[in-house]
Interface confidence: low
C-alpha cells in the first residue's frame, strides 16, 4: 500500500524536516529558517512558535520540532503546552481573584502555584496527628491513638465543610 | 505534544446513557481542569461544567445536574461524562477542553464526539 | 444565571476592514471574560482571556477592551483566515455561559 501511495503522490516520499515544495515539481525542500514539519509528507512547513516577553524559549525550534516555552521567573505556566503565564503567588498562599491570598485555616499549599487543599484528616485512617498542618504543609499522621501511650494526646484538625479553591476564579 | 483525543461516534435511543471518554497526553491532568462543552447542530456552544482530575470534585451546570457525571482515571490520564436520560435536544458535538486551576483557560481541545439520539 | 449577550449575531466584511464584536453581560464579570474563534467542522480556539491578555500566537490585530458589563473584540485588519464564528465566554461565575456567537462572513 506505501509503496502503491508513493508512486501515486510523490509528497509521501517527504520527511519531516522538509515539504513538498508545488513550484518545485513537488521535490521535497528543506522548511526554510524559523519553521518545521513534525510528520512527513506535508506540503507546507508550520512557522515556529516564538517565546517573547514573559515567555522564555525551553526548547530550541529545529526542522522537526516546534520550539517550547516557559515563563521568566517569577511566573509560572498555565493551561496545556504552557500558552499563557501567571504569577507566581508564595507556597501557604494560593491565587485568587484578588491576587495571592493566604491558605485558609485547615488548608495547605507547599507550591508556588495551584490551590490550598486541606490538611490530611488522620483520624479518617484511625491514626492521630504526628506534627500539625500549617499554610505551607500538610499535617503528618502518626500511628493511632490507641497505639500511643497512656497520657498522650493528640490532636486532629477540623476537617474543612468543602474543599477550598474550587471557586470559579 | 499535548492532545486530548475522544472516543468516537454514538448513536444512542431516547432514555438511554452515554459515556464520552477523553484521554490526555503531553501534560499532567492533575495539573489543570477539564470541561465539557458542547454544541448542537448548529447552534452555539454550551458549558455544561468541570472535573478536577487532582481531586475528582466536578462542578455542574443546573441545567444537567442529576443527569451528567464526570469522572477521571488518573492512571490512564482520562477523563469521563456520562450523560443520562437522553433526549433527543442532547444531539450535539460533545467537547473536552482543558482549563487551568484559576482560570477557564480552555486552551487544548479534543477533536470532539458526535452524539445522536434518535429512535 | 449571567447572560452573555453578543452582537452582532452575523457580520459580512471585506478583506482589510475593521471588525467590532461586542459582548454585554447580565451583571457585572469583572474581567473575567474570554474570546473563542471556531471554524466549521472545527474545536473553538482560544484567542483571548481576562479581557485583553492575548495567548501566545494569536496575531497582534486580535485585541480584546472592556470592564464590567461590556466588552469588545476588536480585528484591525481583517485577513482571509479570520472568517469564522466568535464566541465570548463569562467565566466569573458557575455556570460559565458563552455568548451566542458572531459569524463573520466575507462579502
Known amino acids: 500500500f506505501e509503496r502503491t501511495r508513493s508512486l501515486q503522490d510523490p509528497c509521501s516520499n517527504c520527511p519531516a524536516g522538509t515539504f513538498c515544495d508545488n513550484n518545485r515539481n513537488q521535490i521535497c525542500s528543506p522548511c526554510p529558517p524559523n519553521s518545521f514539519s513534525s510528520a512527513g509528507g506535508q506540503r507546507t512547513c508550520d512557522i515556529c512558535r516564538q517565546c517573547k516577553g514573559v515567555f522564555r524559549t525551553r526548547k530550541e525550534c529545529s526542522s522537526t520540532s516546534n520550539a517550547e516555552c516557559d515563563c521568566t521567573p517569577g511566573f509560572h505556566c498555565l493551561g496545556a503546552g504552557c500558552s499563557m503565564c501567571e504569577q507566581d503567588c508564595k507556597q501557604g498562599q494560593e491565587l485568587t481573584k484578588k491576587g495571592c491570598k493566604d491558605c485558609c485555616f485547615g488548608t495547605f499549599n507547599d507550591q508556588k502555584r495551584g490551590i490550598c487543599r486541606p490538611w490530611t484528616n488522620c483520624s479518617l485512617d484511625g491514626k492521630s496527628v504526628l506534627v500539625n498542618g500549617t499554610k505551607e504543609r500538610d499535617v503528618v499522621c502518626g500511628p493511632s491513638p490507641a497505639d500511643l501511650s497512656p497520657g498522650a494526646s493528640s490532636v486532629t484538625p477540623p476537617a474543612p465543610a468543602r474543599e477550598p479553591g474550587h471557586s470559579p476564579q | 505534544q499535548v492532545q486530548l483525543v475522544q472516543s468516537g461516534a454514538e448513536v444512542k435511543k431516547p432514555g438511554a446513557s452515554v459515556k464520552v471518554s477523553c484521554k490526555a497526553s503531553g501534560f499532567n491532568i492533575q495539573d489543570t481542569y477539564i470541561h465539557w462543552v458542547r454544541q448542537a447542530p448548529g447552534q452555539g456552544l454550551e458549558w455544561m461544567g468541570r472535573i478536577d482530575p487532582a481531586s475528582g470534585n466536578s462542578e455542574y451546570a443546573q441545567k444537567f445536574q442529576g443527569r451528567v457525571t464526570m469522572t477521571r482515571d488518573t492512571s490512564t490520564s482520562t477523563v469521563y461524562m456520562e450523560l443520562s436520560s437522553l433526549r433527543s435536544e442532547d444531539t450535539a458535538v460533545y467537547y473536552c477542553t482543558t482549563g487551568n486551576l484559576h482560570y477557564a483557560l480552555m486552551d487544548y481541545w479534543g477533536q470532539g464526539t458526535s452524539v445522536t439520539v434518535s429512535s | 444565571d449571567i447572560q452573555m449577550t453578543q452582537s452582532p449575531s452575523s457580520v459580512s466584511a471585506s478583506v482589510g476592514d475593521r471588525v467590532t464584536i461586542t459582548c454585554k453581560a447580565s451583571q457585572p464579570i469583572n474581567t473575567y471574560l474570554s474570546w473563542y474563534q471556531q471554524k466549521p467542522g472545527k474545536a473553538p480556539k482560544l484567542l483571548i482571556y481576562?479581557?485583553?491578555r492575548k495567548v501566545d500566537g494569536v496575531p497582534s490585530r486580535f485585541s480584546g477592551s472592556g470592564s464590567g458589563t461590556d466588552f469588545t473584540l476588536t480585528i484591525s485588519s481583517l485577513q482571509p483566515e479570520d472568517f469564522a464564528t466568535y464566541y465570548c465566554?463569562?467565566?466569573?461565575?458557575?455556570?460559565?455561559?458563552f455568548g451566542g456567537g458572531t459569524k463573520l462572513e466575507i462579502k
Open positions: 481576562r479581557v485583553n
Open positions: 465566554l463569562q467565566y466569573l461565575d458557575f455556570p460559565y455561559t
